[in-house]
């Protein structure tokens, strides 16, 4: 049977249906139900978040509805002995503490459970010490302290920045710098857009808001103690000291109005260049320590949370295929929020409770998708993409068999100006042909489609006349499905102009002051925007688990493979007389990038020409779609992060946020002029180059005619 | 320099309302919350409520609610405390004074308005 | 609401003396403490916020501290421009409440 004659509803009016269905007015509803209480990971409120979520959705008509629990480490402040920075003069007595809590915002003044700001994973410890500020503390910030300024940031507490890369990056470059703890602020200059009021008269961050993070380097593990395996009844647990990726230094977040108490005492050298200065009234000296009249005074933490294994609650839902039940397509997003989660997650869970609620509806009506759609609420993922990733490891045959896609449903709005799609290009086309099809909420675009204000708002830095479409990095769900598992993935949401706003992310990202208010007042008022980020993910989840062929276009991948190659071999150019000595070569390359283009494209005219009639070879080509992307995974992983397989993507080494091309080899050329061993060194760009031009010409085959 | 002028001493009777007013200078009006607080003849302070002219937005002690009205002319950067049904216990000083946003503390005071409410 | 509490609420001390006010909430205020000056028939002056921060202006000699729910305002060597009636205030939650002040005498 075909997936039209399992319905009573007509086909072209199958996707119109769906869409029809969602309403603006049901995901506000949802948003403030799940916002009016915190729902930290391994809490009771987020497991009977869990049971509610379960319970909707079985009521809203899926098949069946689980929770999946898991016993993963998770850390927490200690209640009765709060964590704190303090600056202390010669006698070791405190002249200054930073704050223990962040102001309560109107409304939520007697709400218990809201977890102080902290940065979880961080170890206990009251090191003390002179102040060095370290800008973002990126990688190039680094190299500019150490090997420009000869500054030792060695046994010294480090004050960085919060934006530009993800805090774990910092935390990881810190410690290899040496430092004994560090500091993480919010600095006006990303934190506060000119123009607007701070919370709660806009969106910008108070002076005592401060972001809550993990600081762990995981490198797509999940839990840290049982990597690679499923957290379950039975698992075999690390010690904490063999843990994956908990930071070794104590480290702690504060808000700008702390921050300036630290700064504006600092001495030492000048900032290097402007770049280095934020938005306070503080020289931004770089220090070591503070200037001559404090120069006795020094710089204590005071650490005391504790890591704790705790029992956290996915809740899976499925809605049967009625054609291949045993093709997954899975939509899915976190639960779990910092505090109240008024955007991360909350805007992107109450999106996906829509999506739920409009495919329950057309289900009732006798409908069925094609293939099998996965729902799930994913639990800790703030603590490392936890929930996700044990439910992953735990399901990894069905998934690396069965898996079609994958689309992330985290936060759906950090802005209000446009739309942001990150995606494997085997999605291209379906993103471009669905935002084509729906209507732009955007002022200005009445009557237009979204495809028309995204390319106008956001055009593509290559192509013209379409939009730009990014490459995934991690820092969310999708990651242990595409960098581990090679399942196609891609993600949406709403955003800021990145012209105007250079601020890093949303202002009041992971503070207490992310309620729905924030969003019901200041971001979308009439929530057109979260309704449109309904209608594009749960649009791509529709076509992909109802069209006949699979709606890939492995032409797409064939041209970013180019590009890809074109950009590392520019990068490797910059050292020609290395690569003369060394006989490097990207030839092999090339040569594969070509080959693929080549079988890309027959088989693109195939897919065209086939008999769809013919349910074997109607398989048989969605196969070769379905298992193209994993084919680009090597199972031995790439150098030092087994769990990062994906040959043509990763999340970047120096920022987890951001996705690199051929980071094999991208990794091998870093600052391979400053490697002690040179022969080395280019010999392990060349093993790299060797896996990149093996894998592409190994997947090209995937798509040649099978026999 | 920043400059709060509140309106002269007032004599009212129970039952009565009183409306106080705050003149703002040397700054920009909109951009700090105003608040009135209280102060009984050899007693203690007591916060009132705040407008807020950024948004008009208001927030008003328990006490006083219902009682208790706060606007603004933002032509003249003046803003109005106006206490209805008033009794002998409303004798008082009031002041406006302001800060900087929701969570910050109160830097520049007016210089007061004594009512006195008596039969 | 949260109460607050100052002690003493009266203190006998003489020009150079080291002066210490305390102040203490019903529940943690984390640093959200401003410390205010007020001299017969004038307004309330702010001289301390959030704990411990000084108000530009105001002498170095004036020092705040505390944590949670305890705090103290510190008179390092009291002046005789110093004779005044002392408020602590919480800044954290409304509504805004004040401690019943605590006037410094001349000795």
């Known amino acids: 049977k075909s997936s039209n004659e399992a319905t009573n509803i007509t086909p072209k009016h199958n996707m119109k249906a769906f869409l029809d269905e969602l309403k603006a007015e049901n995901i506000k509803k949802f948003l403030y139900n799940f916002t009016q209480i915190p729902h930290l990971a391994g809490t009771e409120q987020n497991f009977q978040l869990a049971k509610q979520i379960q319970s909707q959705w079985k009521e809203f008509g899926l098949d069946s509805v689980e929770l999946a629990h898991y016993d993963v480490l998770l850390s927490y402040p200690n209640k009765t002995h709060p964590n704190y920075i303090s600056i202390i003069n010669e006698d070791g007595n405190e002249i200054f503490n930073t704050s223990l809590f962040e102001p309560p915002p109107p409304g939520y003044e007697n709400v218990s459970d809201i977890v102080p700001p902290f940065s979880a994973f961080s170890p206990q410890g009251m090191p003390e010490g002179d102040l060095v500020y370290v800008n973002y503390a990126r990688t190039e910030d680094f190299f500019k302290l150490e090997r420009d300024m000869k500054i030792n940031c060695s046994g010294k507490i480090v004050i960085a920045r919060y934006g530009k890369v993800f805090r774990g990056n910092k935390v990881k470059n810190a410690q290899l710098a040496g430092a004994k703890g560090v500091i993480l602020y919010s600095d006006p200059a990303d934190y506060f857009a000119p123009g607007v009021k701070s919370y709660p008269d806009g969106w910008n961050l108070p002076g005592g808001g401060v972001q809550r993070g993990n600081i762990l380097n995981l490198n797509g593990a999940g839990d840290p103690l049982t990597p690679g395996y499923p957290a379950n009844e039975y698992a075999y647990r690390r010690g904490i000291a063999e843990a994956v990726g908990l930071p070794s230094i104590p480290v702690h977040p504060i808000g700008y109005y702390d921050a300036q108490k630290l700064l504006e005492k600092m001495g030492g050298s000048a900032p290097p260049d402007s770049s280095w200065r934020g938005s306070l009234k503080v020289p931004y000296n770089v220090g070591p320590g503070f200037t001559g009249n404090f120069s006795t005074q020094k710089v204590k933490m005071h650490i005391h949370s504790t890591n704790e294994v705790t029992r956290i609650y996915n809740v899976i839902g499925t809605l049967r295929g009625a054609v291949e039940p045993d093709r997954y397509v899975i939509l899915g997003g976190h639960r779990d929020s910092w505090v109240f989660g008024g955007i991360d997650p909350q805007s992107g869970a109450a999106v996906v409770h829509e999506i739920v609620r409009s495919f329950g509806t057309l289900k009732k009506e006798g409908w069925r998708p094609r293939r099998t759609i996965l729902f799930a609420s994913w639990d800790a993922e703030e603590f490392g993409l936890l929930g996700s990733t044990e439910w992953a490891e735990e399901n990894s045959r069905l998934l690396q068999e069965r898996g079609v896609a994958y689309i992330n449903a985290d936060s759906s709005i950090e802005g209000n100006y446009t739309l942001r799609v990150d995606c494997t290009p085997l999605m291209y086309s379906l993103v471009h042909n669905l935002t084509k099809e729906l209507k732009s909420p955007d002022e200005g675009f009445e009557g237009k489609s979204l495809y028309e204000s995204w390319t106008k708002k956001s055009p593509s830095p290559e192509f013209s006349g379409m939009p730009r479409i990014s490459k995934l990095g991690s820092g969310n769900d999708f990651e242990v499905f595409f960098q581990r598992l090679g399942i196609a993935s891609g993600r949406a949401r709403y955003t800021k102009n990145w012209e105007t706003n250079k601020f890093s992310g949303y202002p009041l990202y992971h503070s207490v002051y992310e309620t729905y208010e924030l969003v019901e007042k200041f971001y979308d008022p009439m929530f057109k925007y979260h309704l449109t980020v309904a209608q594009v993910r749960g649009g791509m989840v529709f076509e992909l688990a109802n069209s006949i062929v699979l709606p890939f276009d492995c032409r797409d991948y064939a041209v970013v493979l180019r590009k890809y190659a074109d950009k590392i071999y520019s990068i490797s150019m910059k050292h020609p007389q290395e690569m003369k000595t060394y006989s490097v070569s990207f030839d092999s390359l090339f040569s594969a990038v070509k080959n693929f283009t080549e079988i890309a494209s027959k088989f693109s005219e195939r897919l065209q020409d086939f008999d769809k009639s013919n349910p074997i070879v109607l398989r048989m080509m969605n196969d070769q779609l379905m298992f193209l992307e994993r084919a680009f995974i090597d199972p031995l992983g790439l150098p030092d992060r087994p769990f990062y397989r994906h040959v043509i993507y990763a999340p970047s080494s120096h920022n987890k946020y951001a996705g690199e091309s051929f980071p094999g080899i991208y990794d091998a050329l870093f600052d391979i002029e400053s490697k002690v061993d040179p022969s080395k060194a280019w010999g392990e760009v060349k093993r790299q180059i060797y896996v990149a031009a093996f894998t592409v010409q190994a997947a090209a085959e995937t798509l040649s005619e099978v026999a | 320099q920043v400059q709060l002028v509140q309106s002269g001493a007032e004599v009212k009777k129970p039952g009565a309302s009183v409306k106080v007013s705050c003149k703002a200078s040397g700054y920009t009006f909109t951009d700090y919350y105003m608040h009135w607080v209280r102060q009984a003849p050899g007693q203690g302070l007591e916060w009132m409520g705040y407008?807020?002219?950024?948004?008009?937005?208001?927030r008003y002690a328990q006490k006083f609610q219902g009682r208790v009205t706060m606007t603004r002319d933002t032509s003249t950067s003046t803003v109005y405390m106006e206490l209805s049904s008033l009794r002998s216990e409303d004798t008082a000083v009031y002041y406006c004074?302001?800060?900087?946003?929701?969570?910050?503390?109160?830097?520049?005071w007016g210089q007061g308005t004594t009512v006195t409410v008596s039969s | 609401d949260i109460q607050m509490t100052q002690s003493p609420s009266s203190l006998s001390a003489s020009v150079g003396d080291r002066v210490t006010i305390t102040c203490r909430a019903s529940?943690?205020?984390?640093?959200?403490l401003a410390w205010y000056q007020q001299k017969p028939g004038k307004a309330p002056k702010l001289l301390i916020h959030s704990g411990s921060s000084l108000e530009s202006g105001v002498p170095s000699r004036f020092s705040g501290s505390g944590s949670g729910t305890e705090f103290t305002l510190t008179i390092s060597s009291l002046q005789p421009d110093d004779f005044a009636t002392y408020y602590c205030q919480q800044h954290i939650e409304y509504p805004w409440t004040f401690g019943q002040g605590t006037k410094v005498e001349i000795k």
């Open positions: 529940k943690s205020i984390s640093k959200y």
């Open positions: 407008f807020n002219p950024y948004n008009d937005y208001t």
């Open positions: 004074a302001r800060s900087d946003g929701y969570y910050d503390a109160m830097d520049y």
